[in-house]
Amino acid sequence: NQDLPVIKCVLINHKNNDSSVGKSSSYPMVSESPEDLGCALRPQSSGTVYEAAAVEVDVSASITLQVLVDAPGNISCLWVFKHSSLNCQPHFDLQNRGVVSMVILKMTETQAGEYLLFIQSEATNYTILFTVSIRNTLLYTLRRPYFRKMENQDALVCISESVPEPIVEWVLCDSQGESCKEESPAVVKKEEKVLHELFGTDIRCCARNELGRECTRLFTIDLNQTPQTTLPQLFLKVGEPLWIRCKAVHVNHGFGLTWELENKALEEGNYFEMSTYSTNRTMIRILFAFVSSVARNDTGYYTCSSSKHPSQSALVTIVEKGFINATNSSEDYEIDQYEEFCFSVRFKAYPQIRCTWTFSRKSFPCEQKGLDNGYSISKFCNHKHQPGEYIFHAENDDAQFTKMFTLNIRRKPQVLAEASASQASCFSDGYPLPSWTWKKCSDKSPNCTEEITEGVWNRKANRKVFGQWVSSSTLNMSEAIKGFLVKCCAYNSLGTSCETILLNSPGPFPFIQDNIS
């Protein structure tokens, strides 16, 4: 009775990569640590069939299905997916186990299904079955967290109604400005829903699940800070909770804080106060203004006043529906090959947007930065001087926004040539779009100065590669030029580039490139 080989099946998740085809590979990419899939013999099956735990993969994720075989001797293998055989290259690891891998790059619907691996070893034959499906994230949600006061306690609860249930954390910072960036040492994170320490400079609550991370900042007016040049503005949708914190520090406890909406004191039950002494024995007071579910009539100027500090206000605007305000007209830019340049979009939006920059069907992460005037800005600098169309896309729960940019890189033409029995064609991608000349090289004109004007057909732009214009020129073959060398030249304000072509009978055509600045 032969002992069966020890089989281990693992899933390896990869950081996303640009390719998009599934392939069998013996050397997968560097990636996250492998996840065991508990390979087991399928019960009551004829033949030796191992089954791995079914795998759910996010759309566009890249994975490797891997089998480790602890069996003596060499192994040969074959992958089968949807009745197609795929090449299989086993190799051996340091523990002398046979390793077989199937890399699936950028998971799509068509790559979901059953992957069968047939293995033949010296002792036995067996089959390993992987079932790969796309994770149904349609039911997933990630909602921006909001605050509630904890019953009978001076504490805030952070709530995010999301699926799967999110991990909620408070992000606290006691410094000013730049030092409160996410990974700064001044930032403290607390993975809990309730927060009692409400005196910090900057308080945010974040919720994260498989869909990402969403944060809400506790809107704060600090009476010890110089007011912004423009009035701070807070947008909320009807039904959302309103929380504004007013904070003030004074040398002693002899001061009080009050909230007013349009010069009328807030009703009791719509505010609560907390105070503490700081390490240098100064008194910190905070006064929260809150409305559990805002209506249109909660719009207005909220003013926090102190008996010892100048008052400060914020404009609260209640909207029925979210919005994204920005100019959507397309913009064209022309830059030099080494010029530093960034695309930028300035917008005002509520709720906060999710955005992407796209070029050549590839998406890039999008960062947004809040400006003092209530606007935000997103910049994209990672264009690597590639000409073409760049798209900024933003959306929130209620609105969508798209803006197109065209980037042209000023450069000298580069010429490519091709020829057939009846014509010769030259292509160039320089910018500004080049003009063309054709010249004949002969005994009379060894320097190819004899210009050809007959049979030339120029196209300013014959194809658009990811938004990049390509200019072309075609010369129709005539008896007068057959058997001669001809030269096509593309020129613009930055220079000239030429290619020499032998106009022969059908057959291979030698091309000689000439670059003339």
């Epitope: 065991d36 508990g38 087991a40 019960p43 009551q44 735990a53 079914a54 759910e56």
Partner: antibody, heavy 124, light 107 residues
């Protein structure tokens, strides 16, 4: 390498609440075909299944202990937590966590990997 | 709850012996049964799942059979490392239940 590791107090007083944590590695609690169970074994006795939790947060409990048990998980920390209220000396046992795997042809992968167990003594 | 009755509760055997352990379910559990081996101070180790499928890496001297209510674990030729306690588990109905265990001792 699949591992499960139980952690928690060694000694608990009667009426107190026991909180045990199982930290897993080598597989993902996010995988819809993976679940984690808690099982206990009083000294010299047989094994008793307590509870398990699936990736979609579906939970099952032992009928006799249901009112005292709560199982939860934190996928990002790869942890499964079991709390057992109102502890009694008869709850003295080695507590294990173990993995369950589901396959296309059924959930037959019960307890293919176990933690090393943690002995919890209930005594005043 | 489903009762799993394991017999015998202990068995004395010598190296090379054939050992058979039985598990009876109080109602039909189809093939939803697993066998575990446990050594003192260690966690159980799965030997057989789905009544008759051998766990990868487990020697082929271990085999399982049966379905419905009657199940058997057989060790065809007992080895020194096989002296341990063996448990069956049914996972067809909640709550999951284990048998009382069978201790295999050296004769």
């Amino acid at each position: 390498q699949v591992t499960l590791k139980e952690s928690g107090p060694v000694l608990v007083k009667p009426t107190e609440t026991l909180t045990l944590t199982c930290t897993v590695s080598g597989f993902s609690l996010r995988n819809a075909r993976m679940a984690v169970s808690w099982i206990r074994q009083p000294p010299g006795k047989t094994l008793e299944w307590l509870a398990h939790i699936f990736s979609n947060d579906e939970k099952s409990y032992s009928t006799s202990l249901k009112s005292r048990l709560t199982i939860s998980k934190d996928t990002s920390k790869s942890q499964v937590v079991l709390t057992m209220t109102n502890m009694d000396p008869v709850d003295t046992a080695t507590y294990y966590c173990a993995r369950i795997v589901g396959y296309g042809s059924g959930w037959y992968g019960y307890f293919d990997y176990w933690g090393q167990g943690t002995l919890v003594t209930v005594s005043s | 709850d489903i009762q799993m009755t394991q017999s015998p509760s202990s068995v004395s055997a010598s190296v090379g012996d054939r050992v058979t352990i039985t598990c009876r379910a109080s109602q039909d559990i189809r093939y939803d049964l697993a066998w575990y081996q446990q050594k003192p101070g260690k966690a159980p180790k799965r030997l057989i799942y789905a009544a008759s499928s051998l766990q990868s890496g487990v020697p082929s001297r271990f085999s399982g059979s049966g379905s419905g209510t009657e199940f058997t674990l057989t060790i065809s030729s007992l080895q020194p490392e096989d002296f341990a306690t063996y448990y069956c588990l049914q996972h067809n109905f909640y709550p999951l239940t284990f048998g009382g265990g069978t201790k295999v001792e050296i004769k």
